[in-house]
């Protein structure tokens, strides 16, 4: 079998054997090595010699196998844009950011660039649970049967109606999507002005 070509090697069809770790250099019509994550091209390849890589300086990174002559500058998560850091920048990975609690990503360009406050869900509704926190604005859905939510809030969850009998009380008024069940002492009548409260 033919020995495996080691960069630099000639390529007539402009493709390289290992697309991840090699690249086609059109000036010389050869395949050269890319630099691994965390490094950059210190010296370009030629037909005689392969790429030389050097480690990214502090506060810079390259995430992928590359043929970049510089490393990318680490950028902090911008709190003015509603972002917070979840993992620091390394030579191999940019700073990992996410939206601050109570915010969602409003502008996305390969990564989130701007977060905005989540919309309130009105009484009787709650925010639909998402796979990834901060990915989108709230989508408010009605509380399911037997549950209520009585505030305007971006994060309040629908709670189950109180079961009066569990407290040795009786129902004075049924719960709605926006209010809890009203309970009363079974021995006392409930005046109209006391609705929504529980008498012991």
């Amino acid at each position: 079998s033919q020995p495996q070509a080691v960069p630099p090697y000639a390529s007539e069809n402009q493709t390289c054997r290992d697309q991840e770790k090699e690249y086609y250099e059109p000036q010389h019509r050869i395949c050269c090595s890319r630099c691994p994550p965390g490094t950059y091209v210190s010296a370009k390849c030629s037909r005689i010699r392969d790429t030389v890589c050097a480690t990214c300086a502090e506060n810079s990174y390259n995430e992928h196998w590359n043929y970049l002559t510089i490393c990318q500058l680490c950028r902090p998560c911008d709190p003015v844009m509603g972002l917070e850091e979840i993992a620091p920048c390394t030579s191999k990975r940019k700073t990992q950011c996410r939206c601050q609690p109570g915010m969602f990503c409003a502008a996305w360009a390969l990564e989130c660039t701007h977060c905005e406050l989540l919309s309130d869900c009105p009484p009787g509704t709650e925010a639909e649970l998402k796979d990834e926190v901060g990915k989108g604005n709230n989508h408010c859905v009605p509380c399911k049967a037997g549950h209520f939510q009585n505030t305007s809030s971006p994060s309040a969850r629908c709670q189950p109606h109180t079961r009066c009998e569990n407290q040795g009380l009786v129902e004075a008024a049924p719960g709605t999507a926006q209010s809890d069940t009203t309970c009363k002492n079974p021995l006392e009548p409930l005046p109209p002005e006391m609705s929504g409260t529980m008498l012991m």
């Epitope: 210190s42 010296a43 370009k44 005689i48 010699r49 030389v52």
Partner: antibody, heavy 119, light 108 residues
Framework: QVQVQESGPGLVKPSDTLSLTCAVS?????????WGWIRQPPGKGLEWIGY???????YYNPSLKSRVTMSVDTSKNQFSLKLNSVTAVDTAVYYC????????????WGQGTMVTVSS | EIVLTQSPGTLSLSPGERATLSCRAS???????LAWYQQKPGQAPRLLIY???SRATGIPDRFSGSGSGTDFTLNISRLEPEDFVVYYC?????????FGGGTKVEIK
């Protein structure tokens, strides 16, 4: 201006190791340039021995590869050549030179040092 | 390896004349990968031409290079007294780098 200068013993015994150093001035060896060694036997043509980069990467002429070692000392801004098991055919003027940017030709040369292999 | 054959071995000319030096490669090389050097007695070679036709810094325009494939030429339009020395071609298309055997330009 950029200058390179070879130094080392002018006489080496057969089967011994030839050791030469190239001192670079007016230019940092750590700039991403390759450095080379070329030799020229008396009255003959030029022969490329090999390349070294400040990172330590090397390329050698296959005809000499088994006997050649190149190294670099960035703190002293110099690089070195070792050629072991020498014989009379290794008698030559040895030049160090700077690679010309991305072009594999040599734009800055030392004045050369004559090395004679003889007992 | 690529063998470079220079001809003639010696070229006898008078000052002011045009010199044409030939360098032939044992296999085809792109025009971008040939260099020419001048070497004066007791001195190191000096880069004249790279990429077959580009003059190195400080080289007078009487020196010019041309050619492609296997045949390359160094021309010296009007020979000056200091030009009567040895000239080498070098290829950097394939490893190892190789040099031609040289052409000596001497005064007739």
């Amino acid at each position: 201006q950029v200058q390179v200068q070879e130094s080392g013993p002018g006489l080496v015994k057969p089967s011994d190791t030839l050791s030469l150093t190239c001192a670079v001035s007016g230019y940092s060896i750590s700039n991403s340039i390759w450095w080379g060694w070329i030799r020229q036997p008396p009255g003959k043509g030029l022969e490329w021995i090999g390349y070294i980069h400040y990172s330590g990467n090397t390329y050698y002429n296959p005809s000499l590869k088994s006997r050649v070692t190149m190294s670099v000392d960035t703190s002293k801004n110099q690089f070195s050549l070792k050629l072991n098991s020498v014989t009379a055919v290794d008698t030559a003027v040895y030049y160090c030179a700077r690679n010309f940017g991305d072009v594999d030709a040599f734009d800055i040369w030392g004045q050369g040092t004559m090395v004679t292999v003889s007992s | 390896e690529i063998v470079l054959t220079q001809s003639p071995g010696t070229l006898s000319l008078s000052p002011g004349e045009r010199a044409t030096l030939s360098c032939r490669a044992s296999q085809s090389i792109s025009s971008s990968y040939l260099a020419w050097y001048q070497q004066k007695p007791g001195q190191a070679p000096r880069l004249l031409i790279y990429g077959a036709s580009s003059r190195a810094t400080g080289i007078p325009d009487r020196f010019s290079g041309s050619g492609s494939g296997t045949d390359f030429t160094l021309n010296i339009s009007r020979l000056e007294p200091e030009d009567f020395v040895v000239y080498y071609c070098q290829q950097y298309y394939l490893s190892p780098l190789t040099f031609g055997g040289g052409t000596k330009v001497e005064i007739k």
